[in-house]
């Protein structure tokens, strides 16, 4: 039939699978007189034959790995053997079959990894080759760990990138590997072709021996530094060391202190740069960071603890300029009048802040000196010699020396003699009834006023009333403030009420005096009152366990992969229904029952990372109250963007005719992430046919030069195809076109006669 298997002599391309015995002809060329016979030349490899009558066939199986393309020429000859037509190019493309197994470049690999290395950071690559076509599944390799020895608790410490063969630690490996427990591991790695997806794939295995080395990047022991040091600063206090030389060290002050008195040098030695004051700050926690030459952290930061040791550099201080106590006129010897509590800013529970009290003067000395004594260490004042009489001396003044081991301070005490406390406070009501409040009643609200009266001497400790809640409020949700002029008690809310834990509280108040009652008088039922607090439920919104939930996944995760989850609880114990808000790209879905978040579309880091959405937790039932939290999905880069030209290069031209070879510079970019060093592109011409006229040479990782090889160019536009490879894993290649025009120039610009097409080149080279 004309067309598919036969026809006139013209350039043609045929595709034939390798490894197949010939079963039919390739093509029957028809001769046009005066042509009578055909001749075949080129890369025949004694496989391709053309019969005189034009029948093109092959006589044995092809092998793509020997030659992937056979470039043949067919010519038509007349009766005298002279070419009358052609030769025309005939291209035979050999299609790949999976007839080669992958082979590891080494039967054994050796590597080492430091304990606590970052999970996912490759420390070793295994590499296999497969002679089959990498553009087809036949040559696409898939790496896998077959076994890890030893395997502890069924936990994998190592992982391999299926595509690149990069071996790294898992999260468990990073945390648990310890050379003291297990200094070496063996992995058996397999590689399969067909992307690992076919039962018919070929495979190979290799052995990997891994040595675990000690990580000396460890936090030093906590440091103690004496305050107010007079030694010359800076003073070395500790050190950190990265595992290899050349690390750049720095300190990070997480507390953002106004002054940060520490520094680190490039050996990793840590210094205190100025004297410390324990009373200003008694401890410091900061971090030491090691970075590589590009400023990238080599590992996690180390926590440095510095404790500031106390010296006795603070004298005791009095609680107030004058401390006032009251004593009833009939009080018995030894009774406590009050306690003077002085302070010392030095470290608690040490000799530097341990205080002694001593009375140095009493005025007036009536009826005698030494009426009072003070407990040396406790500061408690007691009546020492006799009962006092208000009409004789209504007031005494004491000077008290308070001392620590180095300093002395004088404090002043005024003691007022008051009438005896022989009357108890009496509540005006014994039962204040029921009070119903919503659980969201504001803190600080006054919810009840209570009143007791006391017939003792007004405005003294004998008649002053203190109200205490002695029953029904173990959580301390309520408090009572007293008006000192009227002895009215105001019951206030100190902590939030909670229907769920305390719906009904039976509260009991006690009214008492700060002064002790005289001997024989006791508080009775008149000094007690009660009331019942009933708390009503207010439906509260669910509460998320975090304000922001964060997850990290590779941008090429399969659709349906779980990428994170959120949790919320409802105070009333109702179930939660979760939903997403602001998923503008339609990438995610949330399981409304569990809060798990799944991908439902391909993710793309280059579209923006992190991807931020809101998660909504709604209580199921009730009043359907809801709360909102953030979910941030950090997308980790994969090499999925081929290189391209960094800008528009239309309008490039050379003045025709060229007087000497010329060149121009162009820049490439891609949208993938290039940490620290930037891209590392390689450049080549896009097709072999361009090599006679052009050459491309790399300038750096992003720029290349396109040069002419000669000066014999026509006056027209040439489109130069350039292949740019990003060297990634896997490598991606972009073929870009640079249009270059050779034109007549006037004053260094392209000249076009009037009426010529628009869009003339404007950049001369």
């Amino acid at each position: 039939q004309e067309g598919k298997f036969s026809g006139p002599l013209k350039p043609m391309t045929f595709s034939i699978y390798e490894g197949q015995e010939p079963s039919q002809i390739i093509f029957q060329f028809k001769a046009n007189p005066p042509a009578v016979t055909f001749e075949l030349t080129g890369e025949t490899d004694n496989i391709f034959v053309i019969e005189r009558e034009g029948l093109l066939y092959y006589n044995r199986a092809l092998d793509r790995e020997t030659r992937s393309t056979h470039n043949l020429q067919v010519a038509a000859l007349d009766a005298n053997g002279i070419i009358v037509e052609g030769p025309v190019p005939i291209t035979i493309k050999v299609k790949d079959i999976n007839d080669n197994r992958p082979t590891f470049l080494q039967s054994k690999y050796e590597g080492s990894v430091r304990q606590n290395s970052r999970p996912g950071k490759p420390f070793l690559y295994v590499n296999a080759t497969d002679l089959d076509d990498p553009a087809t599944p036949n040559g696409q390799l898939y790496y896998q760990i077959v076994i890890q020895l030893p395997m502890i608790n069924n936990v994998m410490y190592f992982q391999i990138n299926n595509k690149t063969g990069a071996i790294s630690l898992t999260r468990e490996g990073s945390q648990e590997l310890n050379p003291a427990k297990n200094p070496s591991y063996n992995l058996v790695i397999s590689v399969k072709d067909m992307g690992g997806q076919s039962e018919n794939s070929f495979s190979d295995t290799t052995s990997v021996d891994i040595i675990v080395t000690e990580n000396i990047w460890k936090a030093p022991k906590p440091v103690e530094m004496v305050e107010n040091s007079t030694d010359p600063h800076p003073i070395k206090i500790t050190q950190v060391r990265w595992n290899d030389p050349g690390a750049q060290y720095s300190l990070v002050d997480k507390e953002k202190l106004p002054r940060f008195p520490f520094s680190i040098d490039q050996e990793g030695d840590i210094y205190v740069t100025q004297p410390l004051d324990r009373e200003e700050k008694d401890a410091y926690v900061f971090y030491a960071v090691a970075k590589d030459e590009y400023g990238k952290p080599l590992s996690y930061p180390l926590e440095i603890h510095v404790k500031v040791k106390d010296i006795n550099d603070n004298p005791p201080t009095c609680p107030s300029p004058v401390t006032v106590f009251e004593v009833q006129e009939n009080e018995r010897l030894g009774n406590s009048i009050g306690t003077l509590t002085a302070h010392d800013r030095d470290e608690e529970n040490t000799a530097n802040s341990f205080l002694n009290y001593r009375i140095v003067e009493q005025t007036p000395k009536l009826p005698m000196d030494g009426l009072f004594l003070i407990q040396t260490y406790a500061g408690m004042l007691q009546l020492a010699k006799q009962s006092l009489k208000k009409q004789d001396t209504p007031q005494y003044n004491l000077t008290i020396e308070v001392s620590d081991k180095d300093f002395k301070t004088l404090c002043f005490v005024q003691i007022n003699v008051i009438d005896i406390n022989d009357q108890i406070p009496i509540f005006e009501k014994s039962d204040y009834g029921n009070l119903t409040l919503a659980e969201d009643t504001n803190i600080g609200s006054t919810i009840l006023t209570i009143q007791a009266t006391d017939a003792d001497e007004p405005f003294t400790g004998s008649s002053k009333i203190l109200y205490h809640i002695i029953k029904g409020d173990s959580e301390g949700r309520l408090g009572v403030d007293t008006d000192p002029h009227t002895n009215t008690g105001y019951v206030i809310i100190k902590k939030p009420l909670d229907f769920e834990t305390a719906a009904v509280s039976n509260i009991v108040f006690k009214a008492e005096n700060p002064e002790p009652l005289v001997f024989g008088v006791k508080y009775n039922a008149s000094s007690f009152a009660k009331f019942t607090l009933i708390v009503t439920d207010v439906n509260e919104a669910p509460q998320f366990s975090q304000h922001v939930f964060q997850a990290k996944v590779s941008e090429d995760v399969a659709i349906g992969t779980k990428v994170g989850n959120v949790t919320a609880k409802d105070p009333e114990g109702l179930d939660i229904s979760y939903s997403l808000r602001g998923d503008t790209r339609g990438w995610l879905k949330i399981d409304h029952v569990t809060g798990e978040i799944f991908s439902v579309a391909p993710l793309d880091r280059e579209a923006g990372s992190p991807y931020r959405v809101q998660v909504v937790a709604t209580e199921v039932g009730g009043s359907s109250l809801s709360s909102v939290s953030e979910f941030h999905l950090i997308l980790m880069d994969v090499n999925d963007n081929p290189p391209r030209l960094a800008k528009d290069y239309t309008g490039l031209f050379f003045c025709h005719p060229l007087s000497a070879p010329g060149s121009l510079i162009f820049e490439a970019t891609d949208d993938d992430q290039h940490l620290f060093r930037g891209p590392h592109f390689t450049f080549s011409l896009g097709s072999g046919s361009l090599q006679n006229d052009w050459e491309v040479s790399k300038i750096n990782g992003t720029h290349a030069r396109l040069s002419t090889r000669h000066t014999e160019f026509e006056e027209r536009e040439y489109v130069v195809l350039i292949r740019i490879n990003d060297g990634g894993r896997p490598p991606l290649e972009g073929i870009v076109s640079l249009p270059v025009t050779f034109c007549s120039c006037v004053e260094g610009s392209c000249f076009r006669p009037a009426g010529h097409q628009t869009g003339i080149p404007t950049v001369g080279m």
Partner: antibody, heavy 117, light 108 residues
Framework: QVQLVQSGAEVKKPGASVKMSCKAS????????MHWVRQAPGQGLEWIGA????????SYAQKFQGRATLTVDTSTSTAYMELSSLRSEDTAVYYC??????????WGQGTTLTVSS | DIQLTQSPSSLSASVGDRVTMTCRAS???????LHWYQQKPGKAPKLLIY???NLASGVPSRFSGSGSGTDYTLTISSVQPEDFATYYC?????????FGQGTKLEIK
């Protein structure tokens, strides 16, 4: 008391669709998730999916995604499950169950579905 | 998906016996989201124990549950005639919710 009453038995041909119902009473329909679970003859229980009648949110087991559709009619307190592209292995008893705290507190009596050519 | 494996798949007991059955998860499950059901032939399943150890309303105290992580247990302290049935464990820690294949308790 809480009751879930399911529609009657169904016989369908392969490739067809079926829609079964579950009428709830004795509680506030919109205040609890409704789950669907099936049990093939002589086999264990298999969760199909859940719907929250309060706002229509649904979750499905991956296996049933795209083939099962859960809906509700809050005016009649009825939940529905539609299963399309039926095959013989869909022959089972289908239960609706009221959810609470991620467990299934009350169950319907079940709807028997037979798929046969 | 989390797989639940129940063992034994069946067991025989006499009235008054103490029986224990286990449910093992392929990965860790929060004890709040592991539940047990009882099913009798031709009937719908019935909630028995929720959140590992809490008895559902009306369930006799001879039933008890325990466990954490990947291993959970259902115990009947003294089997009664009405207890002969199939028992299923269920997890809903992560979606999809999954059930064990069941343990059938038969009369010896």
């Amino acid at each position: 008391q809480v009751q879930l009453v399911q529609s009657g038995a169904e016989v369908k041909k392969p490739g067809a669709s079926v829609k079964m119902s579950c009428k709830a009473s004795g509680y506030t329909f919109t205040s609890y998730n409704m789950h669907w679970v099936r049990q093939a003859p002589g086999q264990g229980l298999e969760w199909i999916g859940a719907i929250y009648p309060g706002n229509g949110d649904t979750s499905y087991a991956q296996k049933f995604q795209g083939r099962a559709t859960l809906t509700v009619d809050t005016s009649t307190s009825t939940a529905y499950m539609e299963l399309s592209s039926l095959r013989s292995e869909d022959t089972a008893v289908y239960y609706c169950a009221r959810g609470r705290g991620r467990y299934f507190e009350y169950w319907g009596q079940g709807t028997t579905l037979t798929v046969s050519s | 998906d989390i797989q639940l494996t129940q063992s034994p798949s069946s067991l025989s007991a006499s009235v008054g016996d103490r029986v224990t059955m286990t449910c093992r998860a392929s990965s860790s499950v929060s004890s709040s989201y592991l539940h047990w059901y009882q099913q009798k032939p031709g009937k719908a399943p019935k909630l028995l124990i929720y959140s590992t150890s809490n008895l559902a309303s009306g369930v006799p105290s001879r039933f008890s549950g325990s466990g954490s992580g990947t291993d959970y247990t259902l115990t009947i302290s003294s089997v009664q005639p009405e207890d002969f049935a199939t028992y299923y464990c269920q997890q809903y820690d992560s979606s999809p919710s999954t059930f064990g294949q069941g343990t059938k308790l038969e009369i010896k």
